[in-house]
Interface confidence: medium
């Protein structure tokens, strides 16, 4: 599936997002993870997802964003983190979304 550009795994019970996902799917542009059970994001989570334009993370349990998980997403246009448990609008320790 290395040519896959869109992956919709919404409305599941995913609690882990292995960083290798985008190593295997380097062309991925749209990743929909809405309504899953992700609780933490960190630097490695999307480290290889460099071509993403849309990332949908609404309705998870993300309460902690460690360091700079979106620093590699230079092409990101849409990031949806609504309906999570975030207590701050800070999406990491440095400005990442241009």
């Amino acid at each position: 599936y290395s040519q896959l550009t869109s992956l919709d795994v919404g409305f599941n019970t995913i609690s882990k997002l292995e960083p290798e996902l985008c190593q295997k799917l380097p062309m991925l542009k749209v990743l929909n993870l809405q309504h899953n059970e992700l609780s933490q994001l960190s630097d490695k989570t999307f480290a290889f997802c460099t071509n993403l334009t849309e990332l949908h993370l609404m309705s998870n349990s993300i309460q902690k964003i460690k360091n700079n998980p979106f620093v590699k997403q230079k092409n990101l246009i849409t990031l949806d983190l609504s309906h999570n448990g975030l207590s701050s609008t800070k999406l990491g320790t440095q400005v990442q979304l241009e």
């Epitope: 609690s15 882990k16 997002l17 960083p19 290798e20 190593q23 490695k44 480290a47």
Partner: antibody, heavy 119, light 107 residues
Framework: EVQLQQYGAELGKPGTSVKLSCKVS????????IYWVNQRPGKGLEWIGR????????IYAEKFKTKATLTADTSSNTAYMQLSQLKSDDTAIYFC????????????WGQGASVTVSS | DIQMTQSPGSLSASLGETVSIECLAS??????LAWYQQKPGKSPQLLIY???RLEDGVPSRFSGSGSGTQYSLKISGMQPEDEGDYFC?????????FGTGTKLELK
């Protein structure tokens, strides 16, 4: 900061069992995998297996399938490994480890627990 | 199981010298490779993951390269604190397997 706390040294007699613990602070183990690795005296690292604390699913290296049993308690954020039917060549340092959201990269390690098997 | 053959088994390097350690996999591991440093009595520390990604906080003198079955770790300018054991780890297939290890000493 993520920390994995392992406790001290275990002394076991041949044929008995020991249970090692690995308490994680600073990260919810439900969101990752816990790995176990051993190191015999003066030797290299050996991958024992991993557990998914969210559902209890385990994967073992073949040689540890009847030797090690991995469990986890998400309420206390602690993982366990029981070693059964101890033999002298089970004498080793046993490490627990984890990584961000799983995957093969173990980027946080416990300090190791020593197991000595002797009659 | 995938076998990871590491070479050399030991080496001695002078201060400032460039050092390379190789890891050869018995089959293609698609860059699912990490490098660890271990000092006596301590737990391993991650240096490199995904064959060439430097872990946060690791000095830039460490670098990784390779693909397919052949991978290497390079230390550009040996420092006293670089003494220790180095291991590669493949994460392409279960069971994950470590390399045989390389002991690096300061000459």
């Amino acid at each position: 900061e993520v920390q994995l706390q392992q406790y001290g040294a275990e002394l076991g007699k041949p044929g008995t069992s020991v249970k090692l613990s690995c308490k994680v602070s600073g990260y919810n183990i439900w969101s990752t995998y816990i790995y176990w690795v051993n190191q015999r005296p003066g030797k290299g690292l050996e991958w024992i297996g991993r557990i998914d604390p969210a559902n209890g699913n385990t994967i073992y290296a073949e040689k540890f399938k009847t030797k090690a049993t991995l469990t986890a308690d998400t309420s206390s954020n602690t993982a366990y490994m029981q070693l059964s039917q101890l033999k002298s060549d089970d004498t080793a340092i046993y490490f627990c480890a984890m990584g961000d959201h799983g995957g093969y990269v173990m980027d946080a390690w416990g300090q190791g627990a020593s197991v000595t098997v002797s009659s | 199981d995938i076998q990871m053959t590491q070479s050399p088994g030991s080496l001695s390097a002078s201060l400032g010298e460039t050092v390379s350690i190789e890891c050869l996999a018995s089959e293609d591991i698609y860059s699912y490779l990490a490098w660890y440093q271990q000092k006596p009595g301590k737990s391993p520390q991650l240096l490199i993951y995904a064959a060439n990604r430097l872990e946060d906080g690791v000095p830039s003198r460490f670098s990784g390269s390779g693909s397919g079955t052949q991978y290497s770790l390079k230390i550009s300018g040996m420092q006293p604190e670089d003494e220790g054991d180095y291991f590669c780890l493949q994460g392409s297939e279960f069971p994950y397997t470590f390399g045989t290890g390389t002991k690096l000493e300061l000459k």
